[in-house]
């Protein structure tokens, strides 16, 4: 009915779209909840975050385990009162993902 | 402060976080604006979409050129009146990206 090769290609594509940790670039300032006058160079870093598809609409791809990766970045405060400082940051890195039910929404939220 | 080799690697990392086409998985039904009684198997496909960081907060990573990729998927209509059919779908694939100013927000929007 369907040729094996086509089914194989479809299945491989499907596997690649599944919920799993994927390399993503995250903006450090918003990640750390920094004030708008604080900037980082580079402003973004690559870490793994959960992404991809779940089989059912009621499920969402969520992290089940997280580690925190150590990075060093230049922090720049505006107005520029001092030389950019090399500061340590710890960025969340998703190490495990799962399709989980979306949190039940409160009718008044 | 840093040797040339380290600065080169830092720059390479920064380049990797920049606005560019990135492999992303998209949900076909919502992409094609299908009715809620039409499903695809697999429900998601991998294509390239613009993503990554821009140097300024006022800029957003946007697509400047797009191609359309043909994928073969099973289309399932509910209630199940016939056998799932293998159909070709064309999904937008971003081939060029640029950091562009965010659309000016209308005061009443």
């Amino acid at each position: 009915f369907y040729d094996i090769e086509t089914l194989k290609v479809i299945d491989e594509e499907w596997q690649r779209t599944q919920c799993s940790p994927r390399e993503t670039c995250v903006e450090v300032a918003s990640e750390l909840g920094k004030s708008t006058n604080t900037f980082f160079k580079p402003p973004c870093v690559n870490v793994f975050r959960c992404g991809g598809c779940c089989n059912e609409e009621s499920l969402i791809c969520m992290n089940t385990s997280t580690s925190y990766i150590s990075k060093q970045l230049f922090e720049i405060s505006v107005p520029l009162t001092s030389v950019p400082e090399l500061v340590p940051v710890k960025v969340a890195n998703h190490t495990g993902c799962k399709c989980l039910p979306t949190a039940p929404r409160h009718p008044y939220s | 402060f840093y040797d040339i080799e380290t600065l080169k690697v830092i720059d390479e990392e920064w380049q990797r976080t920049q606005c560019s086409p990135r492999e992303t998985c998209v949900e076909v039904a919502s992409e094609l604006g299908k009715s809620t009684n039409t499903f695809f198997k697999p429900p998601c496909v991998n294509v390239f979409r613009c993503g990554g960081c821009c140097n300024e907060e006022s800029l957003i990573c946007m697509n400047t050129s797009t191609s359309y990729i043909s994928k073969q998927l099973f289309e399932i209509s509910v209630p199940l009146t016939s056998v799932p059919e293998l159909v070709p779908v064309k999904v937008a694939n971003h081939t060029g990206c640029k950091c562009l100013p965010t659309a000016p927000r209308h005061p009443y929007s």
């Epitope: 990075k71 940051v89 | 380290t6 920064w14």
Partner: antibody
Framework: DVQLQESGPGLVKPSQTVSLTCTVT??????????WNWIRQVSGNKLEWIGY???????VSNPSLKSRISITRDTSKNQLFLQLNSVTTEDIATYYC??????????WGQGTTLTVSS | DIVMTQSPSSLAMSVGQKVTMSCKSS????????????LAWYQQKPGQSPKLLVY???TRESGVPDRFIGSGSGTDFTLTISSMQAEDLALYYC?????????FGSGTKLEIK
């Protein structure tokens, strides 16, 4: 000079909850870019990281202990606390608090010994 | 979790001899964007808490004698004592600070022959 001093009950009974305190002097625990850690050392000299509380109050714990521990702080007293629930003889160790500047543990306390016995 | 494997577990050396101990991690400790290895070495003398010797795999902490030399990158690291002194009798631990949960090696016990 930065100093860390741990204190605790010393002896607890199995299944009880224990609370350990780390008092920091010479440095504010809310100073940016420092994380305040709990580390334990069992009799075989094995060092095990328990978790930290950050300068902003966020906590991260070792998944192997996560369900049994809680790390909190009192910024007015410049103290951090470790609460360990349902203790067993496997929790017998010297408990250290240590400061982390994002790269390494630069200051350690002298440690407090926890003994679990009925 | 990142597993840290130290070897040997103990070694007995004479004063003045060169001492070498190894530490291997189960994954790379090289962090971007600064391209530093998040590996530290600590010395623990009997009855004391651990003391930092080396960080970023090869940067000596201030006040640490220059006979302590850290080297390596990625997953393979070494601590060398160029000329052992009697006061170096201690336990030596490597520790990864790359990602939580932070993990330590099981230690190398240095004894005097």
């Amino acid at each position: 000079d930065v100093q860390l001093q741990e204190s605790g009950p010393g002896l607890v009974k199995p299944s009880q909850t224990v609370s350990l305190t780390c008092t920091v002097t010479g440095y504010s625990i809310t100073n940016r870019y420092h994380w305040w850690n709990w580390i334990r050392q069992v009799s075989g000299n094995k060092l095990e990281w328990i978790g930290y509380i950050s300068y902003s109050g966020d906590t991260v714990s070792n998944p192997s202990l996560k369900s049994r521990i809680s790390i909190t702080r009192d910024t007015s007293k410049n103290q951090l606390f470790l609460q360990l629930n349902s203790v067993t003889t496997e929790d017998i160790a010297t408990y250290y608090c240590a400061r982390d500047g994002g790269i390494y543990f630069d200051y350690w306390g002298q440690g407090t010994t926890l003994t679990v016995s009925s | 979790d990142i597993v840290m494997t130290q070897s040997p577990s103990s070694l007995a050396m004479s004063v003045g001899q060169k001492v070498t101990m190894s530490c291997k991690s189960s994954q790379s400790l090289l962090s971007s964007p600064n391209q530093k290895n998040y590996l530290a070495w600590y010395q623990q003398k009997p009855g004391q808490s651990p003391k930092l010797l080396v960080y970023f795999a090869s940067t000596r902490e201030s006040g640490v004698p220059d006979r302590f030399i850290g080297s390596g990158s990625g997953t393979d690291f070494t601590l060398t004592i160029s000329s052992m002194q009697a006061e170096d009798l201690a336990l030596y631990y490597c520790q990864q600070h790359y990602s939580t949960p932070y993990t330590f090696g099981s230690g190398t016990k240095l004894e005097i022959k």
